[in-house]
Interface confidence: medium
């Protein structure tokens, strides 16, 4: 999102996501932020605090177990993706406070706002990997006993990260800073140089690969898993279902506004009233998507409390219980014993 639809090929210091409210009179330098921006700031602040502390705790808990516990590998990678994205928040926060002025330079403009998209792709690909793991545990338990190991899990995570980086490249390449005036400021955003087809292509790929296809495949995947676990009368099927729904649903719920507004803006003319309205909501949509970066630790804690009745243990031990219990393939039944089997699929499959 954040498109400029702007080119200035002929001047040297063309060096930026949201533009000024250009369709209204400019009564003052407009020192008051718009309501969507204020809401975005509140969300950013909460996400940063919860996301950095929560994901740091998850990383700390899972890092020690990652050598021997496959579930820990999944959660570790998801937490790292979320943690990295949260590191960009102070800069994004500062920019919104300054009415979207971007004083941090071109390199920061390319990298920092792209982190949330890297998180989206990394999370959804890791979630797909975790889902495949869940699926195999249920439907191919013998294969899992023979081949399911930490080495393979790390390779799968590396592939997921590599693909995520590749898919983030378009956003990275088209992101630039540019000057704006009345009043003077530098903005950070994407510039497709009036190429609407290219802009639409990027938005469609993002929607399909980052949202619709994962939604379809994960829905099918977990439908099969839950049907099997129910048919085998798994003792934890109800709780498992709740965790799965919470984890997967959170990803799609929090990314929905960003994806919808993004695809709409790519098909609208920049001067249209709807485009300008969506532009004003852009920061709010991004902040809403950013909730994914702090929701996982919350789900883990809530799930842990649910499984243990009350929070009698310390937070680290509760998380360790939730995140590092290894799935065991039973010989007689094809379902996992892990308290949070399906928690693995969470992580904001962004």
């Amino acid at each position: 999102m954040d498109s400029f639809n702007y080119t200035t090929p002929d001047y040297g210091h063309y060096d930026d996501k949201d533009t000024l409210d250009l369709n209204t009179p400019v009564d003052k330098t407009s020192n008051t932020l718009r309501v969507p921006d204020i809401l975005a700031l509140v969300i950013f602040a909460v996400v940063f605090l919860v996301g950095v502390l929560g994901n740091a705790l998850v990383v700390w808990v899972t890092a020690f177990e990652a050598k021997r516990t496959i579930n820990a590998i999944w959660f570790l990678n998801l937490a790292v993706a979320d943690f990295l994205s949260c590191l960009a928040l102070p800069i994004l926060f500062t920019s919104i406070v300054q009415h979207h002025h971007w004083p941090f330079g071109g390199a920061a403009c390319s990298i920092l706002p792209s982190l949330i998209l890297l998180n989206m792709y990394a999370s959804i690909l890791l979630l797909a990997t975790i889902s495949a793991d869940r699926f195999l545990l249920v439907f191919k338990p013998i294969w899992c006993q023979n081949f399911r190991g930490a080495g393979l899990a790390w390779i799968a995570c590396a592939v997921a990260w590599g693909l995520a980086l590749l898919l983030t490249i378009p956003s990275f390449l088209y992101r630039v800073v540019r000057e704006e005036y009345f009043p003077p400021k530098v903005l950070c955003g994407v510039d497709y140089s009036h190429d609407k087809r290219r802009e639409r292509a990027v938005a469609i790929v993002r929607l399909v690969l980052g949202f619709l296809w994962p939604l379809l495949t994960l829905t099918i995947c977990y439908t099969f898993i839950l049907l099997r676990t129910w048919s085998r009368r798994a003792t934890r099927s109800t709780k498992t279902l709740k965790v799965v729904v919470a984890v997967v649903a959170s990803f799609f719920i929090f990314w929905l506004p960003y994806q919808v507004t993004g695809i709409m803006m790519s098909f609208l003319e920049p001067s249209s009233p709807t485009f300008l309205l969506l532009k004003k909501l852009d920061s709010l949509c991004v902040s809403f998507a950013y909730i994914n970066c702090c929701i996982n630790p919350i789900i883990y804690v809530v799930a842990g409390q649910g499984f243990q009745g009350r929070l009698r243990k310390s937070l680290p031990s509760l998380l360790r219980n939730v995140l590092t219990e290894e799935s065991v393939v039973r010989e007689s039944k094809s379902f996992t014993r892990s308290t949070v089997d399906t928690m693995a699929q969470k992580t904001q499959a962004v």
């Epitope: 702007y6 250009l22 003319e269 920049p270 300008l276």
Partner: antibody
Framework: DIQLQESGPGLVKPSQSLSLTCSVT?????????WNWIRQLPGNKMEWMGH???????RYNPSLKNRISITRDTSKNQFFLKLNSVTTEDTATYYC????????????WGQGTLVTVSA | DVVMTQTPLSLPVSLGDQASISCRSS???????????LHWYLQKPGQSPKLLIY???TRFSGVPDRFSGSGSGADFTLQISRVEAEDLGVYLC?????????FGAGTKLVLT
Amino acid sequence: DIQLQESGPGLVKPSQSLSLTCSVTGYSITSGHYWNWIRQLPGNKMEWMGHISNDGSNRYNPSLKNRISITRDTSKNQFFLKLNSVTTEDTATYYCALFYFAYASFAYWGQGTLVTVSA
Amino acid sequence: DVVMTQTPLSLPVSLGDQASISCRSSQSLLHSNGNTYLHWYLQKPGQSPKLLIYKVSTRFSGVPDRFSGSGSGADFTLQISRVEAEDLGVYLCSQSTHVPPTFGAGTKLVLT
């Protein structure tokens, strides 16, 4: 070389609308910067009225309230000023000007057109 | 709006003289980005304004080096080291730091 040229009626009746055209040569109005209307009132007082940017969005001087509209025709590389409900106080020389980002100022101006509001 | 006050309103000079025109703004024109968006224009009789100096002191292309701009904050000066006949006209200062951009009333450079 960037050139701007204003055109339009020199006489407008009070309460009617004033419409002017600025034709641009040597640069595409969709390529960047701000395309402005500025007027010089009697006594040399210069007043910025508003602009249309390369993507078609506008900004206006609040002193003109809701009377002003700036539009464009990209196929003809022209942009337009429409000022509604004019009074004798709108008598002025009207200039179109390019606010060029490299200079952060109104670097290129049209020659201006005098518009008189009179019954 | 930011008010731009120019002094004097009329400046009589002889050819070859040095001329100095002052421009004062009602608030500082220093932007938080470190730039000061104060510009000078020359409007000759019957013509449109032409950009002379932008951002306080940078000469626009084709402007002779006898023109120089200086100042900071809210006080600025345009100096012409040796006035020539082609320099006669109205000098306007303008700011684009604040919204809306505003202009001074002008200083008319005339021959004594």
